[in-house]
Amino acid sequence: ITQQDLAPQQRVAPQQKRSSPSEGLCPPGHHISEDGRDCISCKYGQDYSTHWNDLLFCLRCTRCDSGEVELSPCTTTRNTVCQCEEGTFREEDSPEMCRKCRTGCPRGMVKVGDCTPWSDIECVHKESGTKHSGEAPAVEETVTSSPGTPASPCS
């Protein structure tokens, strides 16, 4: 993430004929010119803006990392949507990288949920039915992960 992405410069457009508080804004897919008079299109496939704005620059498109697949490309109004490759997932508490899914559950547990691009396999104790989310010290069975279809932009 660049400084531009975190804190884009802002400026309200000076226009003589003001009819609304939002008049100095540019539509999604654009940013405002240096002098605040014009709206300039973002560059297709390079940068984007998702809301009405007074940004002096559009936001840079995310590039999917190795280990990710591109679900949908960056347009001038929407960032790239990336997804973890089959057999890997992205955790909420570590969204910066895709982690390998476990291949099976520990002894005494059964698989109740497949590996998806946004979650590891889900295991529960055979008797109690309580979930287990730690690393598997021993594997009882090998499971084949099946990918899902989330639609969340990369961070």
């Epitope: 609304s20 939002s22 008049e23 999604p28 897919g29 709206c39 297709y44 009405w52």
Partner: antibody
């Protein structure tokens, strides 16, 4: 079906004002930007400005900012353009057109309103 | 303001011919170019945007190309109904501006 229905032809005297309307239907009015475009007889097209009903954002082409005033009535899904201090130079066909909140190309157009300024 | 120049006001062609209509911008417009067709007494109709993306329902005989300042609309096999007026438009920076138009005529 998306439709932009414009008001009828106008014959107006020099110095007067006129208000043209464009009624939108077949889509969510507050999700698209509506524009006005001028076409003088036998000539090219000129972009006048936009009105976005979603946040009342207005932008004028500098050339028209003292000539045109854009407004809207959300209850009837209608945008208006008032042209003031009319001269023969304002005689033209005026189109309303819409675009999504993205690149500034126009996917649907009204049928046009012919304005004639003559004494 | 960016000036869009369509150097040919008229172009002669025949049904079945391939024809290319050109448009030159006074500065780089980063492929933010649209093309419209306008028939007499009608409103313009969007054909192409982002220089080469065909609008929904537009026949595939219409193709757009170009980058920087130079853009082209090509009709690969002209039909009788294509003999009309074409405009280019830059949607890169406001005020959005149009070319002066090119009228396709029968040879």
């Amino acid at each position: 079906k998306v439709q932009l229905q414009q008001s009828g032809a106008e014959l107006v005297k020099p110095g007067a004002s006129v208000k043209l309307s464009c009624k939108a239907s077949g889509y969510t009015f507050t999700e698209y930007i509506l524009h006005w475009v001028k076409q003088k007889s036998g000539q090219g097209l000129e972009w006048i400005g936009w009105f976005y009903p979603g946040n009342n954002n207005i932008k004028y082409n500098e050339k028209f900012k003292d000539k045109a005033t854009l407004t809207a009535d959300k209850s009837s899904s209608t945008v208006y353009m008032e042209l003031s201090r009319l001269t023969s130079e304002d005689s033209a066909v005026y189109f309303c057109a819409r675009h999504e909140q993205g690149p500034g190309y126009f996917d649907y157009w009204g049928q046009g309103t012919t304005l004639t300024v003559s004494s | 303001d960016i000036v869009m120049t369509q150097s040919h006001k008229f172009m002669s062609t025949s049904v079945g011919d391939r024809v290319s209509i050109t448009c030159k911008a006074s500065q780089d417009v980063n492929t933010a170019v649209a093309w419209y067709q306008q028939k007499p007494g009608q409103s313009p109709k969007l054909l192409i945007y982002w220089a080469s993306t065909r609008h929904t329902g537009v026949p595939d005989r219409f193709t757009g190309s170009g980058s920087g300042t130079d853009y082209t609309l090509t009709i690969k096999s002209v039909q009788a109904e294509d003999l009309t007026l074409y405009y280019c438009q830059q949607h890169y920076i406001t005020p959005w501006t149009f070319g002066g138009g090119t009228k396709l005529e029968i040879k």
